[in-house]
């Protein structure tokens, strides 16, 4: 039999919760890495690719050491929501051109969505302040050309890759402090 009605649920071990979040983040990172390899193979594009609508990288090394769990999770969730939106946009806007990257893009989107839900759950389990709902973001303009869309795909996957490494580092550092 479970706990008597009204008794608080045993709070899960926060280190174990963080660990499972790190592992999910790393699996998403590996999906992203493999998709980036495919993208570079099928649609080579040299040089840096930027997209103004993407979030800027969250943190530098100096700041990473001073991070607190609420700020990491809040920032990570906001950035990943933006990347989810960009992946959805990419799949809609470039459906036929990037057909060779399906179902991998779909898998990436699913796992990104799952990580976002995991972060939300982690924030509630750690009794961190819940964020107000995000204001609706302005719609992303369709790419000006197929090549513009491919450059955007490079920028989105490259940015997500680096953001996820930052996330793993931040979460691992925080785990050692719990």
């Amino acid at each position: 039999p479970g706990p008597p009605p009204g008794s608080p649920r045993a709070s899960p071990d926060p280190r174990a919760e963080l660990d499972s979040t790190v592992l999910l983040t790393r699996s998403l990172l590996e999906d992203t890495r493999q998709l980036t390899i495919q993208l570079k193979d099928k649609f080579p594009a040299d040089g840096d690719h930027n997209l103004d609508s993407l979030p800027t990288l969250a943190m530098s090394a100096g700041a990473l050491g001073a991070l607190q769990l609420p700020s990491v999770l809040t920032r990570l969730r906001a950035d990943l929501l933006s990347y989810l939106r960009h992946v959805q946009w990419l799949r809609r806007a470039m459906g036929s051109s990037l057909k060779t990257l399906e179902p991998e893009l779909g898998t990436l989107q699913t796992r990104l969505d799952r990580l976002l839900r995991r972060l939300q759950l982690l924030m509630s389990r750690l009794a961190l302040p819940q964020l107000p709902p995000d204001p609706p973001a302005p719609p992303l303009a369709p790419p000006s050309s197929t090549w513009g869309g491919i450059r955007a795909a490079h920028a989105i996957l490259g940015g997500l890759h680096l953001t996820l490494d930052w996330a793993v580092r931040g979460l691992l550092l925080l785990k050692t402090r719990l």
Partner: antibody, heavy 119, light 111 residues
């Protein structure tokens, strides 16, 4: 060709420090982490830590925390490992290795730098 | 830390034979769809060389006679038909969590 070229062998006295360099070429330096691995005679390979060239933010094996310092010079595509308070058990070959972001497997290795600690 | 135990410690075989090397982890290294185990080859005086990553992915440039399998705590590196250049020491490594650790190695010798 993707290459990691390390600095030459070092002989140090106990208590001293050593700084090893690792020059990367043939790939985009910021796209991978740089890891450092120790191989002492008759011992297992041991991971020391890694650094992300874009973010900085080294992560260390607890065993080396406080004694190992990892840095990068992005403009020169070079990573450095400094090991302080050297003791005889630090005598080993030290490798830099290119690591997939946050995955800690190593697909390109430097040639190794032999560090001998002896009085 | 996760401890990796490789067996056998040494193995003597002839060219053309099949080699099966084992690596056992002290706890599961598989999660979220990936198995965080990797295999390296090292020859005397040289740096290790990545052969297999994430349990079963063949690294670019590595001959197809090398393959990796397993999940959870038990992993295998198989060399289907040994060539002269395959005689070396083989290490498994996990990266399921930090710190990544290596097995003690299996030395593959010519019979």
């Amino acid at each position: 060709e993707v290459q990691l070229v390390q600095s030459g062998a070092e002989v140090k006295k106990p208590g001293a420090s050593v700084k090893i360099s690792c020059k990367a070429s043939g790939y985009i330096f910021r796209d991978y982490n740089m890891d450092w691995v120790k191989q002492a005679p008759g011992q297992r390979l041991e991971w020391i830590g890694d650094i992300n060239p874009t973010i900085g933010a080294p992560i260390y094996n607890q065993k080396f925390t406080g004694r190992a310092t990892l840095t990068v010079d992005k403009s020169a595509s070079t990573a450095y490992m400094e090991l302080s308070s050297l003791r005889s058990e630090d005598t080993a070959v030290y490798y830099c290795a290119r690591g997939a972001l946050a995955h800690w497997y190593f697909d390109v290795w430097g040639q190794g730098t032999t560090v001998t600690v002896s009085s | 830390d996760i401890v990796l135990t490789q067996s056998p410690a040494s193995l003597a075989l002839s060219p053309g034979e099949r080699a099966t090397l084992s690596c056992r982890a002290s706890k599961s290294v598989s999660t979220e769809g990936y198995s965080y185990i990797h295999w390296y080859q090292q020859k005397p005086g040289q740096a290790p060389r990545l052969l297999i990553y994430l349990a079963s992915n063949l690294e670019s440039g590595v001959p197809a006679r090398f393959s990796g399998s397993g999940s959870g705590t038990d992993f295998t590196l198989t060399i289907s038909s040994l060539e002269e250049e395959d005689f070396a020491t083989y290490y498994c490594q996990h990266s399921r969590d930090l710190p990544p650790t290596f097995g003690q190695g299996t030395k593959l010798e010519i019979k």
